[in-house]
Interface confidence: low
């Protein structure tokens, strides 16, 4: 049976914590991704950005978990209007920003 939204979000947050806390070298070899607008549609936007990173095992689980939150199919190369125009940041910073934002959502009880 599907897990409750609160449990799924908690698991996603804890995976992001694992990534941020366990870095011994630049995450994904310092790969850059498009920054996103965190105020709406965050899961799909995050997936659309991270899906363009390949060959980085550290974020594969995060990519799969985000896919479970996003109601539509996401493929590499596509990007919605939620992208922050012409702004790229390192994957490590992206994951960190996403983590802090999702922690706020969790505290506020916004699980979907």
């Amino acid at each position: 049976s599907p897990v409750p939204p609160s449990t799924a979000l908690k698991e996603l947050i804890e995976e992001l914590v694992n990534i941020t806390q366990n870095q011994k070298a630049p995450l994904c070899n310092g790969s850059m991704v498009w920054s996103i607008n965190l105020t709406a549609g965050v899961y799909c936007a995050a997936l659309e950005s991270l899906i363009n990173v390949s060959g980085c095992s550290a974020i594969e689980k995060t990519q799969r978990m985000l896919n479970g939150f996003c109601p539509h199919k996401v493929s590499a190369g596509q990007f919605s209007s939620l992208r922050v125009r012409d702004t790229k940041i390192e994957v490590a910073q992206f994951v960190k920003d996403l983590l802090v934002h999702l922690k706020k959502l969790f505290r506020e009880g916004q699980f979907n």
Partner: antibody, heavy 122, light 108 residues
């Protein structure tokens, strides 16, 4: 209101033992990770130990490992620190502090007790 | 084990901006928390998760974190801000909480 109150401090000789307690009130104790942090006179903060919300995991600073034991009793809303083989360098104010557990150990200490003084001296 | 480095002291005139730094290897990838401690009192959380503020803390307190340096910024400094400030992270490689050595903020 939410409160943490430490007790059990005092003067003790090197090599002896002491047991500190921390009484929690005003919040759901069993859902929080709990820590001990100490501060030697005129020095900075030094983390001592953590115990998970359910007591399932415990971690200690290298300086106290094997000598100190952290425990909790969720039915009594109490945190304890058993300190054995005390040394002069253990002299400090000992604080208990809580950290929301759902984020495991990355969370901040959002509530502190006022501290209890431990002096190890012959 | 992981080390956090803070300047021992920072001085600032009232009304000016104080910046207290906390250095650590790849600290930008960690969640940094800041505490204020006044003489004879327990520490108080002033910034958590790099830049969030507990509700009772004035907006004058803010934080940032990237690269190898986290920064606590106190704008429009007041005499009551004089205290010791500590940064803190969790070091997953050792399963330890780590505090910086502390910075004494003096309001001139």
């Amino acid at each position: 209101q939410m409160q943490l109150v430490e007790s059990g401090g005092g003067v003790v000789q090197p090599g002896r033992s002491l047991r500190l307690s921390c009484a929690a009130s005003g919040f759901t104790f069993r859902t929080y990770g709990m820590h001990w942090v100490r501060q030697a006179p005129g020095k900075g903060l030094e983390w001592v130990a953590v115990i998970w919300y359910d007591g399932s995991n415990k971690h200690y600073a290298d300086s106290v490992k094997g000598r100190f034991t952290i425990t909790r009793d969720n039915s009594k809303n109490t945190l304890n620190l058993q300190m054995n083989s005390l040394r002069a360098e253990d002299t400090a104010v000992y604080y208990c502090a809580r950290a929301p557990q759902w984020m495991l150990v990355a969370e901040a200490f959002d509530l502190w007790g006022q501290g209890t003084m431990v002096t190890v001296s012959s | 084990s992981y080390v956090l480095t803070q300047p021992p002291s920072v001085s600032v005139a009232p009304g000016q901006t104080a910046r207290i730094t906390c250095g650590g290897n790849l600290i930008g990838s960690k969640l940094v928390h800041w505490y204020q401690q006044k003489p004879g009192q327990a520490p108080v959380l002033v910034v958590y998760d790099d830049s969030d503020r507990p509700s009772r803390i004035p907006e004058r307190f803010s934080g940032s974190n990237s690269g190898n340096t986290a920064t606590l910024t106190i704008s429009r400094v007041e005499a009551g801000d004089e205290a010791d400030y500590y940064c803190q992270v969790w070091d997953s490689s050792s399963d330890h909480v780590v505090f910086g050595g502390g910075t004494k903020l003096t309001v001139l």
